[in-house]
């Protein structure tokens, strides 16, 4: 969490941002809140990006003002116009690109004063893994697949029964470049699996950590997966 304060002139206002990560090709949110104002027409929101001389987005007098927007953000940005009055200056960024990563500034002007706060935005690709029993294999084998990751992640297997065991000798991980030539499909195979055990396939890069669990018993197979972003710090 980053909390910024205005300086000089009018009173300062508190602006708060939260560091976040964007999944390339999908839509992302750059979070920013501020002390609200009574009149929408008195609120100016400017989003800026370090190293980019045009604006990322501007909202003033109750509407978007895009004459100074940089080309790299053309047609890809929007604020939540109906929530500006309650102090939400968050920016929706469509079709996140790898090059969108960087330091952003949320700059606010209201009748109460000015304020700004920075946020770090990371970009990459991350997806939920799915673990299945590979019935085609000669021995009991698990196959963990996740369709989109970038940068290249690490893959680690773990088991509930053999806690702390190193499965690197009995697993094989491959990375297959997807058609857009950036993200990769992750496939990891674990051999010599024993029944009545829960196995976890953990995929991690500097942006996200995802885990796919599978519990194999004689009577059923249970699966569970979750994904966690690693860099959500507020400012």
């Amino acid at each position: 969490l980053i909390i910024g304060f205005g300086i000089s002139g009018r009173h300062s206002i508190t602006v708060t941002t939260v560091a976040s990560a964007g999944n390339i090709g999908e839509d992302g949110i750059l979070s920013c809140t501020f002390e609200p104002d009574i009149k929408l027409s008195d609120i100016v929101i400017q989003w800026l990006k370090e190293g980019v001389l045009g604006l990322v987005h501007e909202f003033k007098e109750g509407k978007d003002e895009l004459s100074e927007q940089d080309e790299m953000f053309r047609g890809r940005t929007a604020v939540f116009a109906d929530q500006v009055i309650v102090g939400n200056a968050s920016l929706r960024l469509k079709n996140v690109q790898l090059t969108d990563a960087g330091t952003y500034k949320c700059y606010i002007i209201t009748s109460k004063g000015k304020g700004n706060a920075n946020l770090e935005y990371k970009t990459g690709a991350f997806s939920m893994p799915e673990v299945n029993v590979d019935y085609n294999a000669s021995s009991e084998t698990l196959r963990c697949e996740a369709p989109r990751w970038f940068p290249q992640p690490t893959v680690v297997w773990a088991s509930q029964v053999d806690q702390g065991a190193n499965f690197s000798e009995v697993s094989n991980t491959s990375f297959e470049l997807n058609s857009e030539n950036v993200t990769m499909k992750v496939v990891s195979v674990l051999y010599n699996v024993t029944i009545n055990n829960t196995y976890s396939c953990m995929i991690e890069n500097d942006i996200a950590k995802a885990t796919g669990d599978i519990k194999v018993t004689e009577s059923e197979i249970k699966r569970r997966s979750h994904l966690q972003l690693l860099n959500s710090k507020a400012s």
Epitope: L53, G54, S67, E68, Q69, E71, R74
Partner: antibody
């Protein structure tokens, strides 16, 4: 008052290179992109590319990649364009112009003549 | 690249006339259309940016309009000093592209 002062006319031989300059004054040099635009005799304007003076980043028109190289010297508030492997086709007036989306201030132009 | 077309390459008018110069883009340019004036000595000045916004110091007889891919520059009450060539330019996407220019002359 914003001013962009360009270097003087150049007469060079085919195959040579040339480096022209654009000195900015009246504003913070690193706050605005510097664009370069070509106008061949009696013709329209062609955007060559732009440089970000804050970090030296460049964007080029595909047509001029390998022909033009854009640089800056922040300490002198000056942008430069080097043109290489010159031919008579490169004879033109070259302008520097400030900003993104539109060019709000222009230099007076540098006339380049390529002739043997 | 986006193609910019100014169909009229030259235009004759009289002092006090109202003159309209048009410009068409090969695709929607979302109002990122700008107009420049080039005097016979080669000096170039911005007149209008973002379709209709008057650049500082430009006389109010200049105005711009349009949307999508069709735009125009209007000079009302033409003056002697308006003799020049006028170029449109799109700033929606890189590379910037310019129209071929419209040369304004007096009858």
């Amino acid at each position: 008052e914003v001013q962009l002062q360009q270097s003087g006319p150049e007469l060079v031989k085919p195959g040579a290179s040339v480096k022209m300059s654009c000195k900015a004054s009246g504003y913070t040099f690193t706050d605005y992109y510097m664009n370069w635009v070509r106008q061949s005799h009696g013709k329209s304007l062609e955007w060559i590319g732009r440089v970000n003076p804050s970090n030296g980043g460049t964007n080029y028109n595909q047509k001029f990649k390998g022909k033009a190289t854009l640089t800056v010297d922040k300490s002198l508030s000056t942008a430069y364009m080097q043109l290489s492997s010159l031919t008579s086709e490169d004879s033109a007036v070259y302008y520097c112009a400030r900003r993104h989306n539109y060019a709000d201030f222009w230099g007076q132009g540098t006339t380049l003549t390529v002739s043997s | 690249d986006i193609q910019m077309t100014q169909t009229t390459s030259s235009l004759s008018a009289s002092l006090g006339d109202r003159v309209t110069i048009s410009c068409r883009a090969s695709q929607d340019i979302s109002n990122y259309l700008n107009w420049y004036q080039q005097k016979p000595d080669g000096t170039i000045k911005l007149l209008i940016y973002y379709t209709s916004r008057l650049h500082s110091g430009v006389p109010s007889r200049f105005s711009g309009s349009g949307s999508g891919s069709d735009y125009s520059l209007t000079i009302s009450n033409l003056e002697q000093e308006d003799i020049a060539t006028y170029f449109c330019q799109q700033g929606n996407t890189l590379p910037w592209t310019f129209g071929g220019g419209t040369k304004l002359e007096f009858k």
